[in-house]
């Protein structure tokens, strides 16, 4: 079959980085600088895509395959293929269109990207706070009020996480 | 004959979006690119970007990537250039052009007329 | 972007005079210019690519040469159907592909 289409169809022998050239009565020319193709039999080659402006290379382009990009320190990929890059935030921020702006009293956000999301409610679930929310953390729930009466088994609250490196005081 | 037929041209006013076609026959749609160029009134002709029908690729000119966008329908042999939130200074006729492994414009459209103005 | 410009931007001549109008990048090119033809109304139509090269069905009397930054189009003898507006497009560097201004072609 490969043979007959290869009859047929001069193209299907170019292989990937290179296209099949109309100028050159069909043969397979190398695809031009600063661009590539990534499948054989193709007719043209493509442009490299540029990683410009906060875009940095991520991997150069090459005959055979496009450049990716990711973004530079500050910003994050959004999008497929890291099509966008959008501004980091604090933890316990979120980006708007004025910039980042502290989360909400009741909203938290834990990572430098994404929107500030409201605290947990625990007494849906029946649970008490263990642990208040702030802007950064969520609340942590504990057991239920009943759960606390005399004779229950008490939960201890986790210890503070210290820096690494420290050694207890 | 081969040849490329540019519609969806027309005035519209500033903040607007139109959508321009380009049809393509008498040669295999998917073996060449689909660019777009414009040439506004007494300026220079300028290249706004491209779509390769073959796999829906595109590059654009960075002045007009955020507005534009470029697709095709294959079962049509017809690209799309959609254009938002036009400016009076859009104002031009666009062209489409066929480009394959090379990057000069083989074959042009006739070109539609884009006015935009309030 | 390169910047693409042509000189002069208008032209007068007859009908039989050899004509040359140029065309300078603003960096090397290489060879990879083209020329294109436009009437009034029409679509440009591509004559010559790979800065020498005339493209199918182009008579024999445009010629282009040139490579780097300096090219030229030459029509040896003109004809009537020849007087138009010519640009050149360099299609060597990253997007965009860029094209001179034009040179207007006109009867004197």
């Known amino acids: 079959f490969e043979r007959t289409r290869s009859l047929q169809d001069p193209c299907s022998n170019c292989p990937a980085g290179t296209f099949c050239d109309n100028n050159r009565n069909q043969i397979c020319s190398p695809c031009p600088p600063n661009s590539f193709s990534s499948a054989g039999g193709q007719r043209t080659c493509d442009i490299c895509r540029q990683c410009k402006g906060v875009f940095r290379t991520r991997k150069e382009c090459s005959s055979t395959s496009n450049a990716e990009c990711d973004c530079t320190p500050g910003f994050h990929c959004l999008g497929a293929g890291c099509s966008m890059c959008e501004q980091d935030c604090k933890q316990g921020q979120e980006l708007t269109k004025k910039g980042c702006k502290d989360c909400c009293f009741g909203t938290f956000n834990d990572q430098k990207r994404g929107i500030c999301r409201p605290w947990t409610n625990c007494s849906l679930d029946g649970k008490s706070v263990l642990v208040n929310g702030t802007k950064e953390r969520d609340v942590v729930c504990g057991p239920s009020p009943a759960d606390l009466s005399p004779g229950a088994s008490s939960v201890t609250p986790p210890a503070p996480a210290r820096e690494p490196g420290h050694s207890p005081q | 004959e081969v040849q490329l037929l540019e519609s969806g041209g027309g005035l519209v006013q500033p903040g607007e979006s139109l959508r321009l076609s380009c049809k393509a026959f008498?040669?295999?749609?998917?073996?060449?690119?689909i660019n777009w160029v414009r040439q506004a009134p007494g300026k220079c002709l300028e290249w706004v970007g491209y779509?390769?029908?073959?796999?829906?690729?595109?590059t654009f000119n960075d002045k007009f990537k955020d507005r534009f966008t470029l697709s095709v329908d294959k079962s049509k042999s017809t690209a799309y250039l959609q254009m938002n939130s036009l400016r009076a200074e859009d104002t031009a006729v666009y062209y489409c052009?066929?480009?394959?492994?090379?990057?000069?414009?083989?074959?042009w459209g006739q070109g539609t007329l884009v006015t935009v103005s309030s | 972007n390169i910047q693409m410009t042509q000189s002069p931007s208008s032209l007068s001549a007859s009908v039989g005079d050899r004509v040359t109008i140029t065309c300078r990048a603003s960096q090397s090119v290489s060879s990879n210019l083209a020329w294109y033809q436009q009437k009034p109304g029409k679509a440009p139509k591509l004559l010559i690519y790979?800065?020498?090269t005339r493209a199918t069905g182009v008579p024999s009397r445009f010629s282009g040469s040139g490579s780097g930054t300096d090219f030229t189009l030459t029509i040896s003898s003109l004809q009537p159907e020849d007087f138009a507006t010519y640009y050149c497009?360099?299609?060597?560097?990253?997007?965009?592909?860029?094209f001179g201004c034009g040179t207007k072609l006109e009867i004197k």
């Open positions: 052009a066929r480009t394959w492994g090379h990057w000069y414009f083989d074959l």
């Open positions: 779509i390769n029908p073959y796999n829906d690729y595109t």
């Open positions: 008498g040669y295999t749609f998917t073996n060449h690119h």
């Open positions: 497009q360099q299609y060597n560097n990253w997007p965009p592909w860029t």
């Open positions: 790979d800065s020498s």
